[in-house]
Structures are given as C-alpha cells and as structure tokens.
C-alpha cells in the first residue's frame, strides 16, 4: 500500500550488520508523486566499486546509485549525508554484505518522503499539446480558445469532424481557410451521395498549401481521400500534387486531414460533384448492343442481342438476347451472360434409323440420318442431312426441324422364289422369298404384313377369332420353330363392313368382301425374314389381265399333307372368273348355283394343278409391280375355291385400297403404354 514517507535501516542498526546478508526494500508512494530518498548515516565496508558490501538504489531498470564507506554531512544544519530525487513513485533499495568484515560497520539509516513532481517541466516529452498545468500530485492540460481537449486529455484540436455532405454538389475547406489550419488536429469529412453516383473531387493547384513532407518523403500534415478500398493520397506540399479531377468510382468518400504540432499553412479548398456511375463499354463477343453509345452511366439499359447462331448460355432456354442495366456499383447487371454458339445438342434418335455421333453439335455442324437399309427407306425425303441452325434446332433443307421417317421397304424379298416342281402344285419356299407371309395358328391360315402395325388377311380367317395369334419370320411352323420366331399380338381386328357374318360359317356361299385388317399392339421390326408387301396402286396399271402371273405362299393343305410344316409357294396365272364358276364345288354344303361370284374376286390357277388350298386363306396373291419390277404388291388374298388343285378365288385388293388406307389412318395413333 503506497505511503507518503518512511524509514529504512540496515539490519541490527545501529549495531554492526551481520555478514552474508541480502535485504531489499520496495518503496512506493501514491501516483503523481516523486520520491526523495536521503541517508542520515552511512557506515559500510569500503571496497572498489562497492564490490564487498553495498546499498543499491534502483528505479525501474535504472541504478540510481550504489553506496559504501563512511559519509558525513557537509551541511552543519542538515543531517543528510547522501540523497536521491526520482520523478517516479516506485524505488527499490537493496543492501548486501559479504562473508567477512575486517572491522565493525554499523550500516545505514535512510528516510524517504513523497515529493510533488512537475510533469510539465520535469520530462523530455511534454505531456500536453498546448498548455500544461501542474498541481501537487498531478497535472492537467488545457487548450486555447476554439480548441477542445481530446478524449486522451492531453491533446487539443479544433472541432472539424463529423460533417456529412449529401448534396450532389458542394465545397469543403480546411478549418480557418485561407488562414492557417489548426495544428495537432484530425479533421474527417464524409461525402455520402445516392447509390449510382460517383463522387468526383476537383482541387485546383493554387487552392492547396499544406506543410511539406520530411526528408524521407513522409507528409507531416496530410490530406487523404478514401473511397471504399481505394485511397487517394496522402497529399501535402505547396500546390496540389494530385489530378485536377479525382473520379472515386464510389458514392461514399471520406476526407481525412491530419496535422501535427508545427508548420501551419493556409490549408486547402475543394469542390465535389456527383457523376452518374459510368459502366465500361464491354466487349461482348458475338453480339450487338442497342442503343450504341460512347459512354454508359448509371441506370442506362442496353439490349444485348446475340448474332445468328449464338445464344445466351444461362437463363431462358434458347434466348437470343438479354437486357443489362448499368448498376449503382458501376458494373453491368447480367454480366455473366454470354453469347455462345448455339448448341443443338445430341440429335434425337429415330426409329429404324441412325445418326452418326457428330463431332460437334454447335451452330453450323452437320449430321446425317440414315435408315436401316435395305429394309427401311426415308419416307419424307430431305436426304437425311441436317445442320445446326441459329435457333438451336437441327434443320433439314426440305423438312425443316421435322425428323426423317424410316419406313419399311415393301414388296422386296431378300431372295427370289425359284420353283421346284412337285406333283400337284407348288414348291418348297423359304420365308426370305415371302417375308410378308404371316402365319395364323387358329384357324390355320395366312396373312400379309403391309406395314409395321398392320396385317392384311381374309375376313373368314378372323371372323371366328378376334384375337388371333400370328407369327412372322419363320419358314417352318413346327412348334419348336415358332417358339424362336416373332409372335405378333393383335390390338384390334377390323373386318370389312361388307362381309356378311353368318351364324353357321361352314355353310357360307358368299365370300364377297372377304378382307380384314389386324392392327398390332407393337410395331414389327423388319429384316431379311420379315418385311411388308406393297399395296396396289389405284391407277389402271394395277388392273389384272388374264394370264398375269402371281405368287401364292402358305402352310395350307398340299398334295401330301393336311397342312404344311414348311412354307410352300406356287406361281399361277390369273384366269377369267368363268373358269372358277365352271369348276364343280367339291361336296357342296349348298346348291352349286348359290355360290356368289363378284368383281371383287380374282380367279387364278388351273395350270398344273397349282392352287391355294385350305390353310392358305388370307395369304397374298403377290404380283410384280408394273411400275417397279423389283417389287411385289398384294393383288389378291386367298379367299375360297371350288376344289383344291383347280382354280381359286382371291379377294381383289385394289378394290379395297381406300378402305384399307382409311382404316389405317383412323386407327394409327400409337397406344400409350
């Protein structure tokens, strides 16, 4: 606890002090006082530098004195033999004695008192910037008129901070301008404009005179401008050294004027104004700016439109332009958006065709679609070549963005049929000779594939079974072979409206309009053993003449079995209808005269006993297309006959082309799975 005075005596004083002693005293007086330490008696073994015995006086880290020997007062009126005055409130006294004393030494007696210090004069560093006032136990600082004492209670300054300027135009000057500015001051001015305007400072050379820099180039007094993370200055000297106009690129500016204790000059005066924030005219490749201007400022809006074949990468799909606004921070909105080459993407795949993987899918790239030849061809033309257009679509010169359609090639067998004559009629055939041949297992019959979704057959084949099981692609209809062939599942059976349905079909004598269509659930995949037969054209070229040859095929009755396991076929000529009428109906169930013959029927056969028979019903009577000798069309469908091995009657398909097309069109919408 600090005291105002005190006494310090060596051990055993006034008796002789003992050997080998070390003792210390920590003196502390109250804050604001110094210490006056004085010795009234001193009798300590003398040695050089007081190496043996000594009393040491320490202030902080400084040794104020080291005493030994005997002392007596020089002043008869004062008992003081040695004294110390320190301007600090703490002092340490240390007494030491060594292991032996040749004589008897009595030590020392000392006293300390707290003394006032003059902080205003006693220290090298003046504690006050202006006026220093000492009092017992302390001091205080004071300021001249118009100055105020800072919070540190030592420094005086003028009240030049706190001004905030918000007007778009204004003038600011240093205190007392053009009279000398106050020393030891820090003046802070704030300019705060509306967002989107930058502060522009104008300072003429002659309006600036601030204490010059020292020899190291450091400003003693300085003017600094701070805008966000950007700083302009510090500036000092005679005449403004900075630019005439300072464009801060910010709506907020802090002005800091710092002065020291010496060298006051007239100071400075500046003007400022708010400029709408400029945005740079950026180079955005592959685009045009609307409107085009030399300079863009805050709130300006431009439309950036991509050149043809380029699009905006982000944002709306396929956008060709975007708007950008000059923002308050001097940056354009939507600056991340760029016009890049349109990417048409991976081209869509097509059924029964392919497209080579493109090297590039960007604007201008070219791709080619091809159909799976020779079983499919491109129906809608256009050559299959598409280029990546500016709108991001793959475009064909003829079809535009519409995809090519690969449809089955009709009427072209992979292998031509060659006859190998048998006893009554027909030869073994391969399904590749008749890839359109469809097998119905109940009743045992035939049909003709006319496209991916439709099978043409005779009405009498399906009238008793509206959900027939059909197979394609197999020469043999042995159960084990059928298991490996393609089974077709019907979705719906369409019997010609002119076909008369009977309660007892066995007694039928009228086979007029013996034609039906079966719509399949799933499309048939074409190949060497499965492909459709063409339909006849409607022109007179497709009118059959007597003697015209056609091919029939099927697994019906032959000269040696009730049904064939392997496909049979025969080539037979068209005959006059009377030839069929003249043949006696085998075991007629009705009067022979009751059998109906109409122009919707074709009579064919009669040569070498070649004929269709029970089990061939619904199969095609295939005739070479008069306009394309490589193709066959279904001129007829096996319908009925008076006797197997003579003449047979076939439904004349040409008379039903309109009904076929209409039925297929009206029922063409694919099922939704």
């Amino acid at each position: 606890e600090p005291t105002m005075y005190g006494e310090i005596l060596s051990p055993n004083y006034p008796q002789a002090y003992p050997s080998e002693v070390e003792k210390s005293w920590d003196i502390e007086v109250p804050e604001g006082y110094g210490i006056h330490l004085y010795f009234t008696h001193l009798d300590i073994e003398l040695s050089e530098n007081c190496a043996y015995d000594s009393v040491q006086i320490i202030s902080g880290d400084t040794e104020e004195g080291r005493l030994c020997g005997q002392r007596s007062s020089n002043n008869p009126h004062s008992p003081i033999v040695e004294e110390f005055q320190v301007p600090y409130n703490k002092l340490q006294v240390i007494f030491k004695s060594d292991f032996s004393n040749e004589e008897r030494f009595t030590g020392f007696a000392a006293y300390y008192v707290a003394t006032d210090i003059n902080e205003c004069t006693d220290f090298v560093d003046v504690p006050c910037s202006h006026f220093c006032n000492n009092f017992i136990g302390g001091y205080f600082c004071s300021c001249p008129p118009e100055y105020f004492l800072h919070d540190d209670m030592k420094n005086c300054g003028v009240n030049c901070s706190g001004d905030v300027f918000t007007a778009l135009i204004g003038e600011i000057a240093s205190p007392n301008y053009p009279k000398p500015y106050p020393e030891n001051s820090r003046c802070e001015y704030q300019i705060r404009l509306e967002k989107g305007f930058q502060v522009v400072v104008t300072l003429r050379r002659e309006d600036f005179d601030v204490e010059a820099a020292d020899s190291a180039g450091n400003c003693l007094d300085s003017l600094v401008f701070v805008a966000g993370d950007r700083q302009f200055g510090p500036y000092c000297g005679h005449g403004f050294p900075g630019p005439l106009n300072i464009e801060t690129k910010s709506n907020a500016l802090d002005i800091i004027f710092q002065t020291d204790l010496t060298g006051q000059k007239k100071g400075w005066k500046l003007r400022y104004h708010g400029d709408p924030m400029p945005c740079p005219k950026e180079d955005t490749p592959n685009s045009v700016w609307e409107p085009a201007k030399a300079k863009y400022v805050f709130r300006d809006v431009v439309q950036i439109t991509c050149l043809d074949g380029f699009e905006v990468v982000e944002g709306r799909v396929g956008a060709t332009s975007f708007y950008s606004t000059c923002q308050s921070n001097g940056k354009w909105s939507n600056s991340k958006l760029k016009c890049q080459p349109v990417d048409c993407g991976i081209p869509e795949s097509i059924e029964n065709g392919k497209v080579e993987d493109p090297e590039s899918t960007l604007f201008g790239s070219v791709i080619r679609y091809t159909c799976e030849e020779p079983y499919y061809y491109m129906e809608n033309g256009g050559g299959g070549e598409y280029h990546c257009a500016g709108n991001g679509s793959w475009v064909n010169e003829v079809l535009g963005p519409e995809l090519p359609k690969c449809v089955p090639v009709c009427g072209v067998p992979r292998e031509p049929f060659e006859e190998k004559q048998r006893i009554i009629g027909g030869s073994d055939a391969d399904i590749k000779n008749f890839p359109w041949q469809v097998f119905f297992d109940n009743p045992w019959a035939g049909g003709a594939l006319i496209n991916e979704y439709w099978v043409l057959t005779a009405a009498h084949v399906v009238e008793g079974n509206r959900e027939p099981t059909m197979y394609v692609g197999s020469t043999s209809v042995q159960t084990s072979r059928l298991a490996k062939s393609k089974m077709l599942t019907p979705e719906h059976v369409f019997i010609h409206p002119g076909w008369k349905l009977l309660e007892v079909p066995e007694g039928r004598t009228n086979f007029d309009n013996d034609i039906a269509l079966v719509r399949l659930k799933d499309p048939v995949k074409m190949g060497p053993t499965v492909s459709p037969i063409c339909l006849p054209g409607t022109s007179s070229d497709y009118n059959l003449m007597d003697g015209d040859l056609g091919l029939i095929s099927g697994w019906g009755r032959t000269e040696k079995r009730d049904r064939a396991v392997r496909l049979k076929a025969a080539r037979l000529p068209v005959a006059p209808l009377r030839k069929c009428k003249e043949v006696k109906v085998e075991k007629p169930t009705a009067d022979a005269e009751a059998y109906v013959f109409t122009p919707n029927m074709i009579c064919a056969g009669g040569e070498k006993g070649m004929d269709s028979c029970k089990g061939d019903s619904g199969g095609a009577f295939a005739v070479q297309d008069p306009n394309d000798k490589t193709k066959f069309y279904a001129a007829g469908l096996v319908s009925w006959g008076p006797q197997c091995g003579t003449y047979g009657l076939y439904t004349r398909v040409k008379n039903y082309v309109d009904w076929i097309m209409k039925t297929m069109q009206e029922n063409s919408t694919p099922r939704e799975d």
Epitope: R422, I423, I424, D441, N442, W444, T479, R557, E559, K560, R561, D562, R563, V565, K584, E586, K587, G609, K614, G615, Q643, C644, G645
Partner: antibody
Framework: QVKLQQSGPELVKPGTSVRISCKTS????????MHWVKQSPEKSLEWIGE????????TYNQRFKAKATLTVDKSSSTAYMQLKSLTSEDSAVYYC??????????????WGQGTLVTVSA | DIVMTQSPAIMSASSGEKVTMTCSAS?????MHWYQQKPGTSPKRWIY???KLASGVPARFSGSGSGTSYSLTISSMEAEDTATYYC????????FGSGTKLEIK
C-alpha cells in the same frame, strides 16, 4: 377301274430280307403318292413311308427308316418295299395304298389287298 | 409325332341304336379322317376332312370335331356297320388311332 395288286404271302427266316411288290392299274401311277402301311395285332395300323413315283422323292416314318426301302418302276407302274434284318416283330400284313386327288384330296383312296409276311426260324 | 387315342377300344350296340366313338389327338390338327375295316379285308376310306362322307358311305354316318377332339357318329346302328374304325391324321407325320371295334348286340 383302279386296282392295286400286291405280291403273295411270304414266310422268311429271321435276319433275311423280303421284297413286296404293288402293281397298279386304272390311274396315272406317277401322279399320286404311294404309301406303305403295316398292320399288326399289337400296334394296329402304322404308316411306314411314302414315295413320289414321279421323281422318287421318299419320306419315311423315322421308326422304319432302317427297316424299309421304297422304290418304284415307272415303266411297269409298280411300287416295291424291301424289308431287311427281319425279326419276329416284323411279322404283319403290309398294305400299299395310293392317294388320289380328283375333286378333293383322297388320302389312302385305294388300298392293295395286303401281303402277309411271317418271320419264323 | 401326334398320338391318336381312340375310345372305346371295343363297343357293341343294338340295331337302331345311336353310336358315337371318339378320337383324341395329342396336339391340334387341321382335319380328321376315318377308315372302316372288316375282317380279312383292306381298310376303306370312310369319312374325310373331318365331316365329308366318302362315296358309297350311308348317310347315317357323320363326323365332327376340331382342334384335338373328334368323333364319328352312326345315327342308327345296322348289322353291316359291324367293323373296326380307325381315325387318321395327316397334319403332321401320318399316324393312326388304335381302332374302335364295333359289334352288334
């Protein structure tokens, strides 16, 4: 009038062969298939095979492929069947039968009178 | 091969009685054919294409059926109908039934 005349009965030893003939008349021999059928008390009627007299095309029942050989002589309108490696199981009546197509398919329209083959040691 | 099963193996009927015998095929066939054989003679074609009567066959005979099930019917039994009747299929490799022996009571 159509007639199929078969050769007479045969008594043969096991392991030997026998040749049965079937002479036809009254129709076009080469126009129709000729069949051979075996009749035994145990197995009733069994089809052995068929031959197309026009081109000699033959189809056998798999069971008789190693047993029977069918041939024709077009000049005499005669069909033949040779049976080899005979055993007691081959003892039966053997028929030739012809198909005929006139106003429809007549399977086995005409039959021979049958030839009795007895295999005995 | 398609196996033909005839039933019954032996049956007898009184004169004027209706007679039905059946033949079942092991898998579906297109037609059934029937043959009549009297002792010591060759078989005769009797009914063909399931329901058609061969020439000279009395009208009291009829045939019917489809798929795997077929039958031969005599509407009114007569003494001359005593014989063995065989069914036969030619849809696949040719096979016969084991026969139904019909006797008069």
């Amino acid at each position: 009038q159509v007639k199929l005349q078969q050769s007479g009965p045969e008594l043969v030893k096991p392991g030997t062969s026998v040749r049965i003939s079937c002479k036809t008349s009254g129709y076009s021999f080469t126009g129709y298939y000729m069949h051979w059928v075996k009749q035994s008390p145990e197995k009733s009627l069994e089809w052995i095979g068929e031959i197309n007299p026009s081109i000699g095309d033959i189809t056998y029942n798999q069971r008789f492929k190693a047993k029977a050989t069918l041939t024709v002589d077009k000049s005499s309108s005669t069909a033949y069947m040779q049976l080899k490696s005979l055993t007691s199981e081959d003892s039966a009546v053997y028929y030739c039968a012809s198909d005929y197509y006139g106003g429809g398919f007549a399977w086995f329209a005409y039959w021979g009178q049958g030839t009795l083959v007895t295999v005995s040691a | 091969d398609i196996v033909m099963t005839q039933s019954p193996a032996i049956m007898s009927a009184s004169s004027g009685e209706k007679v039905t015998m059946t033949c079942s095929a092991s898998s579906s066939i297109n037609y059934m054919h029937w043959y009549q054989q009297k002792p010591g003679t060759s078989p005769k074609r009797w009914i063909y294409d399931t329901s058609k009567l061969a020439s000279g066959v009395p009208a009291r005979f009829s045939g019917s059926g489809s798929g795997t099930s077929y039958s031969l019917t005599i509407s009114s039994m007569e003494a001359e109908d005593t014989a063995t009747y065989y069914c036969h299929q030619r849809s696949d490799s040719l096979t016969f039934g084991s026969g139904t022996k019909l006797e008069i009571k």
